[in-house]
């Protein structure tokens, strides 16, 4: 038995996780660069 609502929900969740992870990496990189420049 397979139901699309679980795949839709899980794909949406994982995309949000990936975006959050990417943003955290970018912001973390910028912060480190700022500290380094000081």
């Amino acid at each position: 038995h397979s139901d699309g609502i679980f795949t839709d929900s899980y794909s949406r969740y994982r995309k949000q996780m990936a975006v959050k992870k990417y943003l955290a990496a970018v912001l973390g990189k910028r912060y480190k660069q700022r500290v380094k420049n000081k």
């Epitope: 038995h1 397979s2 139901d3 699309g4 609502i5 679980f6 795949t7 929900s9 899980y10 794909s11 969740y13 994982r14 949000q16 996780m17 959050k20 992870k21 955290a24």
Partner: antibody
């Protein structure tokens, strides 16, 4: 669409404490280009469900439950449409039915792992 | 790590009665609504009933209803049938960056008289 599980065995894969075992899950009926998260869940006899971890079939990115602590490893073979769970340093407490699931949507029938001396 | 506390652990209901299962999460599930409910019968893998706290899977009878948000969730079975005798589990999706991605509730055994 279905998930076929191998390793261990529906009738019971018997492993000695300290031993290792690889469980695999083959997806069939999917588009070869489709990517998804293959997750693994276990259930000790008479107990509840316990999340182990997930692997993304596209990039191979993984997430594990904190209790796994390096004891188990997830891998995938895109060409074979297969995801595997390597179980190491097994103890009696790892005796359980191990399920693979695609996005918590489609589930494999489970494979029983029995750890006993 | 996060904890999903499911209550009660077992419940008995007469045919036609109502069953309420609670799932309390600490911390909140991601986006306040990423919680699913599963039904499991002996010797079978779990079957998805409800996703996103309240969205019913296709083929699941309308007597099953999911509600709640954030930390408190409920699965209600109205007009219980013999076929509903099973174990029920909630599954939370969390912020993987700060904790485990997922956790299951301890389960609730539903006995139908």
């Amino acid at each position: 669409q279905q998930l076929e599980q191998s390793g261990g065995g529906a009738e019971g894969g018997l492993v000695k404490p300290g031993g290792s075992l690889e469980l695999c899950c083959k997806a069939s009926g999917f588009s070869l280009s489709s990517t998804y998260w293959m997750c693994w869940v276990r259930q000790a006899p008479g107990k509840g469900l316990e999340w182990i971890g997930c692997i993304y079939t596209g990039s191979g990115s993984t997430d594990y439950a904190s209790w796994v602590n390096g004891q188990f490893t997830l891998s995938r073979d895109i060409d074979q449409s297969t995801g595997c769970l390597q179980l190491n340093s097994l103890t009696v407490a790892d005796t359980a039915m191990y399920y693979c699931t695609k996005n918590f949507d489609l589930w494999g029938p489970g494979t029983l792992v029995t750890v006993s001396s | 790590a996060q904890v999903l506390t499911q209550t009660p652990s077992s419940v008995s209901a007469a045919v036609g009665g109502t069953v309420t299962i609670n799932c309390q999460s600490s911390p909140s599930v991601y986006s306040n609504n990423y919680l699913s409910w599963f039904q499991q019968k002996p010797g079978q893998p779990p079957k998805g009933l409800i996703a996103d706290a309240s969205t019913l899977a296709s083929g699941v009878p309308s007597r099953f209803k999911g509600s709640g948000s954030g930390t408190q969730f409920t699965l209600t079975i109205s007009g219980v049938q013999c076929d509903d005798a099973a174990a029920y589990y909630c599954l939370g999706y969390y912020d993987c960056g700060s904790t485990d991605c997922h956790a299951f509730g301890g389960g609730t055994e539903v006995v139908v008289k």
